[in-house]
């Protein structure tokens, strides 16, 4: 071909796989008539006619391009659709008149690879390996041309380093003509690489410029022997009886060694192995003072049969013993005095408090409670609380009941009960005293008696309301060795005028109860009348 030696560089046309390449014949009018042009593809220096233009009309030649070529731009441009990697070649157009001239176009084809897929070596890497071991494999599929791979560790690019880092890359050509790149990173790792993040980056070019895609970050299992073993206790801080305590053995090796936790026996000076759960954790639940002691962990590296011992850890489960009060069951005459003493043991300094049981009122801060000139009202419960102020929730209590000698003491002296004739009435009478009184009724009926506490008794009587009973009322009498006392219940027939709008006419008409604490708390429909307090 004339003038081939000084051919100008071909025009570069860049296009992505699958899109349309526009091949513009760059012959000037002086070089040739564009209405009479032949198009060739050049592959391995062999020209193949692929398209003819005659009088501005285009005609494809039979062959690989037959279905994909068409004319555009009034015949000056040849459009090649569905570009594939195999289309990366030189195309030339040749004008026929006045002189045979040609114009060359270099078609460059590009395809971004898929997201790189990274697979870490699941078997892991021992730190003592003599040569670089496989860390991860990176695969970039279906790119064109072959992308470049760069490996990163903790965000820094890795370079080939003799006996330390080796990157082994290979590629395969798919039937589509696209490339799949596989890159294997091999490295000698150290213990500090256990948390290192590795990823690969694919660099590739498109018509729009240079691009890159990054894989996800991965960490590789790094194996190294245990050098240090230690114990951790949860919760941190002061422990108390009842807590859930976990004693955990930890080691700086990977994989973790086999553990056992043992507790020193002070009498035998031997370490007795404790039963741990499947995770090697010793759970004390609930913790008791007996769990206090010296714990240590032993770890075995079965690869070397080397055994390692942790530093011992002292565990203190703080406790408060049972609280003892003396005297345990005090009895006193009215007007006398009483000293109550509270004792307990603890692993920490104790604080004592005395409280009145009924009211929770603090009577004394300290182990000794002194009561003088005792009245009947002083009888009842006193609670000693022994607590460790530095450990919230660590306390024990003991209740003691004080009995004051005296004749029976009635909950009420008299009361009115609203009733209906011929109904079965349920009456209650309560009395207290020391010794504990017994209660009797002045009418026949079914009576039942129950202890409220050692000094207090409640008697219940079921009786049929008769005209005689309405007339006489009902008396209950409480008696003990020191005397007796009586309460009277007056029965009154209920009628519509006696009912208040908020009275409950359907319940409790037959019930009357009273206690020393809630005066005349009748659930019958009686009207509450002011009544003098009776104290026997």
């Amino acid at each position: 071909v004339p003038g081939e030696a000084e051919q100008p560089a071909p025009e570069l046309v860049e296009v992505e796989v699958g899109s349309t390449a526009l091949l513009k014949c760059g012959l000037s009018q002086s070089q040739g008539n564009l209405s009479h042009v032949d198009w060739f593809s050049v592959h391995k220096e062999k020209r193949t006619l692929i398209f003819r233009v005659r009088q501005g009309q285009g005609q494809s030649e039979p062959g690989e391009y037959e279905q994909r070529l068409s004319l555009q731009d009034r015949g000056a441009t040849l459009a090649l659709t569905q570009v594939t990697p195999q289309d990366e070649r030189i195309f030339l157009c040749q004008g026929k008149r006045p002189r045979s001239q040609e114009y060359r176009i270099q078609l460059r084809v590009y395809k971004a690879p898929e997201e790189p897929n990274i697979q870490v070596n699941p078997l892991g890497i021992p730190v003592n390996s003599k040569e670089p071991e496989e860390v991860a494999t990176c695969v970039g599929r279906n790119g064109y041309p072959i992308p470049q791979v760069i490996w990163y560790k903790n965000g820094r690019p890795l370079k080939e380093e003799k006996n330390r880092v080796h990157i082994q890359s290979s590629q395969t050509v798919e039937s589509s003509g696209l490339y799949t790149l596989q890159s294997i990173l091999k490295a000698q790792l150290v213990k500090e690489d256990k948390d290192a993040q590795f990823y690969c980056e694919l660099n590739y070019r498109l018509p729009s410029g240079n691009h890159m895609k990054e894989s996800r970050e991965v960490t590789v299992p790094v194996f190294y022997p245990t050098e240090k073993v230690w114990l951790e206790v949860e919760p941190v801080g002061m422990l108390k009886e009842g807590d859930r305590v976990e004693i955990r053995c930890l080691a700086d090796g990977n994989p973790p060694p086999h553990f056992s936790i043992s507790k020193g026996n002070p009498s035998t000076r031997e370490a007795e192995e404790e039963t741990t759960n499947d995770n090697g954790v010793l759970v004390l639940e609930p913790a008791r003072k007996e769990h206090s002691g010296r714990y240590e962990c032993q770890a075995w590296n079965l690869d070397t049969m080397i055994s390692l011992l942790s530093e011992p850890q002292e565990l203190l489960v703080n406790y408060v013993s049972d609280v003892r009060v003396s005297p345990a069951a005090p009895e006193r005459q009215e007007g006398s005095s009483l000293t109550l003493t509270c004792e307990a043991e603890s692993s920490q300094d104790l604080e004592f408090q005395w409280l009145r049981e009924e009211t929770d009122q603090v009577l004394e801060r300290g182990p000794v409670l002194q009561l003088h000139d005792l009245k009947r009202e002083a009888g009842g419960g006193y609670r000693c609380v022994a607590s460790v102020p530095s450990i919230p929730g660590l306390n024990r209590t003991q209740l003691v009941k004080l009995a004051i000698f005296g004749p029976p003491w009635m909950a009420f002296k008299e009361r009115k009960v609203w009733v209906k004739e011929n109904m079965v009435l349920n009456l209650s009478c309560e009395a207290s005293g020391h010794p504990r009184p017994t209660i009797s009724w002045n009418v026949n009926g079914t009576a039942s008696e129950g202890d409220q506490d050692p000094q207090r008794v409640l008697s219940t009587l079921n009786v049929l309301v008769t005209p005689e009973l309405l007339e006489t009322g009902v008396e209950c009498t409480a008696s003990n060795d020191l005397g007796k006392n009586t309460s009277i219940l007056f029965l009154e027939l209920v009628n519509l005028t006696t009912l208040t709008p908020d009275s409950n006419t359907t319940t409790g008409l037959s019930t009357s109860t009273a206690s020393p604490h809630t005066r005349a708390n009748s659930t019958s429909t009686e009207r509450k009348l002011p009544e003098p307090e009776s104290r026997g």
Partner: antibody, heavy 120, light 112 residues
Framework: EVQLVESGGGLVQPGGSLRLSCAAS????????MSWVRQAPGKGLEWVAT????????YYPDSVKGRFTISRDNAKNSLYLQMNSLRAEDTAVYYC?????????????WGQGTMVTVSS | DIVMTQSPDSLAVSLGERATINCKSS????????????LAWYQQKPGQPPKLLIY???TRESGVPDRFSGSGSGTDFTLTISSLQAEDVAVYYC????????FGQGTKVEIK
């Protein structure tokens, strides 16, 4: 018959390095834990290093940690001890030992030893 | 670290007599789960490498004469040669493997 033959001992200056080798025969070397034990002249025994059968786990006492490295080449049935930053107190006969199949750490087989002298 | 202390440092016994060597550990070597002690005894004859005699404190290594026996548990151990023979002249070492590995300082046994 189990045989362990140490070599590589000699005279070295303080701060210098030396590499000891132990050639093993008469057993499947790659199946056994191996160790080095030393004995200073006229003194007792001191454990120096242990390596697992595959070579992935190594242990040292504090006296040599960071200065000595135990390694093995199972293909060559060889055990090594790389000794760096040597001190006068490292002067000793170094024995290559093999564990046995017990569930406890014992030095069941010993080589004849190689003498290392650290002196200026 | 666990310290191993042997006593006596040297011992002279008549042929046929009993020789007793003690070894004391600074902590218990007993694994309470398997009820075994992490203690071994070695014998080193003059000019030779050491030889394993006993492991687990009382288990004799195969080929070791039955005049050698080991006893003890926890922190106190004993190697006994029931009837001393001329070939028993050696230095004897105890060794713990409960926490890493440490040897006792050795006990020299001679013939009186």
């Amino acid at each position: 018959e189990v045989q362990l033959v140490e070599s590589g001992g000699g005279l070295v200056q303080p701060g210098g390095s030396l590499r000891l080798s132990c050639a093993a025969s008469g057993f499947t070397f790659s199946s056994y834990i191996m160790s080095w034990v030393r004995q200073a002249p006229g003194k007792g025994l001191e454990w120096v290093a242990t390596i697992s059968s595959g070579g992935s786990s190594t242990y040292y006492p504090d006296s040599v940690k960071g200065r000595f490295t135990i390694s093995r080449d199972n293909a060559k049935n060889s055990l090594y001890l790389q000794m760096n930053s040597l001190r006068a107190e490292d002067t000793a006969v170094y024995y290559c030992t093999r564990d046995d199949d017990y569930d406890v750490k014992v030095f069941a087989y010993w080589g004849q030893g190689t003498m290392v002298t650290v002196s200026s | 670290d666990i310290v191993m202390t042997q006593s006596p440092d040297s011992l002279a016994v008549s042929l046929g007599e009993r020789a007793t060597i003690n070894c004391k550990s600074s902590r218990s070597l007993l694994n309470s789960r398997i009820r075994k002690n992490y203690l071994a005894w070695y014998q080193q004859k003059p000019g030779q490498p050491p030889k394993l005699l006993i492991y687990w404190a009382s288990t004799r290594e195969s080929g070791v004469p039955d005049r050698f026996s080991g006893s003890g548990s926890g922190t106190d151990f004993t190697l006994t040669i029931s009837s001393l023979q001329a070939e028993d002249v050696a230095v004897y070492y105890c060794k713990q493997s409960y926490n890493l590995l440490t040897f006792g300082q050795g006990t020299k046994v001679e013939i009186k």
